[in-house]
Interface confidence: low
C-alpha cells in the first residue's frame, strides 16, 4: 500500500502531500520539496526528508572509540540534490557554486571545492555509531533490558532488520548503538541504516517524522530513557578524503 487508505495520509512521513490520485483512486503521497512519490509503508530516504525540511517554513524545523575516519555531521542542514530513487547525489553544491562530495547519509566527506570538483561514486556509509548520554536515573539501566528495548525500537519503529543492529554498549550514562550494513548485505526492501539513524535522531530530538504517532516513549523496565545528548559518527566503506589542513 502507498498510504493509509482511510484518510489518505502517510504514516511514515508527515512531510508529504497526499491525495487519492494514484492508480484506481488509491492514495498517493509526495514528499514536500521534491514532489517525489514516496512509499508510505517504509521510511522515506534521508535525502528527501532533508529536502522537505528545507522547503518547509523555518519555524517547523564497553564503549567503542570512533575510528580516525569517522565523520560527524558538522555542516548541519542543507538543501540536497537527490537522485531519482531518493538517494543523495554524490556531489552536492550550494547556490554559490561551492561543491563537495557526500556519503550515502549525506555527510560531507571531502574538502569543499568549486564546480570542477568530481565525485565519482556515492560512497556507502556502512557503520554508524550513535552515541547517547541519558539523563540521571535512580540507578543504572539493566544492560540486557536496555539492549533488548533499543533493538526492539529499531526493529519495530524503524523497521530495520535486526541483523543490522550490530551491538548496544552501555557504560552509565553513555549508550552506544552500532548499526552495520555493507552494500552486499542490503537486500531490496531493506531499510537503510542511514535512514533509520536519521529517524531515530529526529525522534530523540522530539521532532518525530511519523504522522500522528506519539513521540518516542522509550522505557526500560518502566523507567523512562531520556536522552540529553546525541552524537552520531559515520564510517564509510572508503575513508574520506580531507586535506591535512582540516585534520590539524
Amino acid at each position: 500500500h502507498t498510504a493509509a487508505q482511510d484518510n489518505c495520509t502517510c504514516p511514515t512521513n508527515k512531510m508529504t502531500v497526499c491525495s487519492p490520485d494514484g492508480p484506481g483512486g488509491r492514495c498517493q503521497c509526495r514528499a514536500l520539496g521534491s514532489g517525489m512519490a514516496v512509499d508510505c509503508s517504509t521510511l522515506t530516504s534521508k535525502c528527501l526528508l532533508l529536502k522537505a525540511r528545507m522547503s518547509a517554513p523555518k519555524n517547523a524545523r564497553t564503549l567503542v572509540r570512533p575510528s580516525e575516519h569517522a565523520l560527524v555531521d558538522n555542516d548541519g542542514l542543507y538543501d540536497p540534490d537527490c537522485d531519482p530513487e531518493g538517494r543523495f547525489k554524490a556531489r552536492q553544491c550550494n547556490q554559490t557554486s561551492v561543491c563537495w562530495c557526500v556519503n550515502s547519509v549525506g555527510v560531507r566527506r571531502t574538502d569543499k571545492g568549486d564546480l570542477s570538483l568530481r565525485c565519482d561514486e556515492l560512497v556507502r556509509t556502512h557503520h554508524i555509531l550513535i552515541d547517547l548520554r541519558h539523563r540521571p536515573t535512580a540507578g543504572a539501566f539493566n544492560h540486557s533490558d536496555l539492549d533488548a528495548e533499543l533493538r526492539r525500537l529499531f526493529r519495530e519503529r524503524y523497521r530495520l532488520h535486526p541483523k543490522f543492529v550490530a551491538a548496544v554498549h552501555y557504560e552509565q550514562p553513555t549508550i552506544q548503538i552500532e548499526l552495520r550494513q555493507n552494500t552486499s548485505q542490503k537486500a531490496a526492501g531493506d531499510v537503510d541504516i542511514g535512514d533509520a539513524a536519521y529517524y531515530f535522531e529526529r525522534d530523540i530530538k522530539g521532532e518525530s517524522l511519523f504522522q500522528g504517532r506519539g513521540g518516542l516513549d522509550l522505557r526500560v523496565r518502566g523507567e523512562p530513557l531520556q536522552v540529553e545528548r546525541t552524537l552520531i559518527y559515520y564510517l564509510d566503506e572508503i575513508p574520506p578524503k580531507f586535506s591535512m589542513k582540516r585534520l590539524t
Epitope: H1, S41, N142, D145, A148, E149, R152, R155, E156, R159, H161, P162, K163, D190, V220, R221, G222
Partner: antibody, heavy 118, light 109 residues
Framework: QSLEESGGGLVKPGGTLTLTCTVS????????VTWVRQAPGEGLEYIGF??????FYYANWAKGRFTISKTSSTTVTLQMPSLTVADTATYFC??????????????WGPGTLVTVSS | YDMTQTPASVEVAVGGTVTINCQAS??????LAWYQQKRGQPPKPLIY???TLASGVPSRFKGSGSGTEYTLTISDLECADAATYYC????????????FGGGTEVVVK
C-alpha cells in the same frame, strides 16, 4: 480478517508433512505469523514465527527440526520432517510474533490436526 | 525465558473471583498476554502488555504485574468463563523454551 491452516492428516512415524497457513483480509507485510501446537489434552506449545522481514525465530526445541517459510504474499508454511508420535497435535497459526508489535497473537486460525501413527 | 503458571486447576462459584499467576524465569518488561481457550476452539486473546484489554473483552478481566510476576484476575465469574487460561511472554524471542505457561483450568460451579 482470517487465517486458515491446511495440510494436516495422518502420517506414519518418520514421515514428513508440510502445513500451510493462508491469510486473508489484512496486509501480510505488516504482521509476523506464528505457529503454535497443542497435543490432545495438553497445553499450548510455541513453535516459532516469521517476522515482517522474512526473518525466522524458533523455540529452542524446534530449531533444526521444523522449518517455517514465507512462501507467498498470503501463505506461510511449516515443514515437519522425521515426525514422531509425540508430534501428534493440533497445529495453529496466529497473527503476531514475539518481540514484535504488542507481542501477542491477536488472530488465530481454527487449527489443523496432525496425527502421527503407524 | 520460561513461564510457570499457577494453579493448574481452580474451582470457583458463579459470581466469585479467581486469580491466576504467571511467573517468568527473567524480566519480560510487561510483554505478557493472557488467552482464554475453550475445548475444540483456538485461544482467544484477553489481555496484552500485561494490563491492556483486547478488543471486545469485558472489564471483569484484569491483568497486572511487572518484571517477572503477573496476575490475571476474573471477577463476577460467569458460567461462560469456564475455560483454560494461558499466559504468554512476548519479550524473549531467540532463546525461548515455550512462550506459554502451562495453563490453568477454571471450573465454574
Amino acid at each position: 480478517q482470517s487465517l486458515e491452516e491446511s495440510g494436516g492428516g495422518l502420517v506414519k512415524p518418520g514421515g514428513t508433512l508440510t502445513l500451510t497457513c493462508t491469510v486473508s483480509g489484512f496486509d501480510f507485510s505488516n504482521y509476523a505469523v506464528t505457529w503454535v501446537r497443542q497435543a490432545p489434552g495438553e497445553g499450548l506449545e510455541y513453535i516459532g514465527f516469521v517476522g515482517i522481514y522474512g526473518d525466522f525465530y524458533y523455540a529452542n526445541w524446534a530449531k533444526g527440526r521444523f522449518t517455517i517459510s514465507k512462501t507467498s504474499s498470503t501463505t506461510v508454511t511449516l515443514q515437519m520432517p522425521s515426525l514422531t508420535v509425540a508430534d501428534t497435535a493440533t497445529y495453529f497459526c496466529a497473527r503476531g510474533g514475539l518481540w514484535t508489535g504488542n507481542s501477542y497473537f491477536d488472530l488465530w486460525g481454527p487449527g489443523t490436526l496432525v496425527t502421527v501413527s503407524s | 525465558y520460561d513461564m510457570t503458571q499457577t494453579p493448574a486447576s481452580v474451582e470457583v462459584a458463579v459470581g466469585g473471583t479467581v486469580t491466576i499467576n504467571c511467573q517468568a524465569s527473567e524480566s519480560i518488561n510487561r510483554y505478557l498476554a493472557w488467552y482464554q481457550q475453550k475445548r475444540g476452539q483456538p485461544p482467544k486473546p484477553l489481555i496484552y502488555r500485561a494490563a491492556t484489554l483486547a478488543s471486545g473483552v469485558p472489564s471483569r478481566f484484569k491483568g497486572s504485574g511487572s518484571g517477572t510476576e503477573y496476575t490475571l484476575t476474573i471477577s463476577d465469574l460467569e458460567c461462560a468463563d469456564a475455560a483454560t487460561y494461558y499466559c504468554q511472554q512476548g519479550y524473549g524471542y531467540s532463546t525461548v523454551g515455550n512462550a506459554f505457561g502451562g495453563g490453568t483450568e477454571v471450573v465454574v460451579k
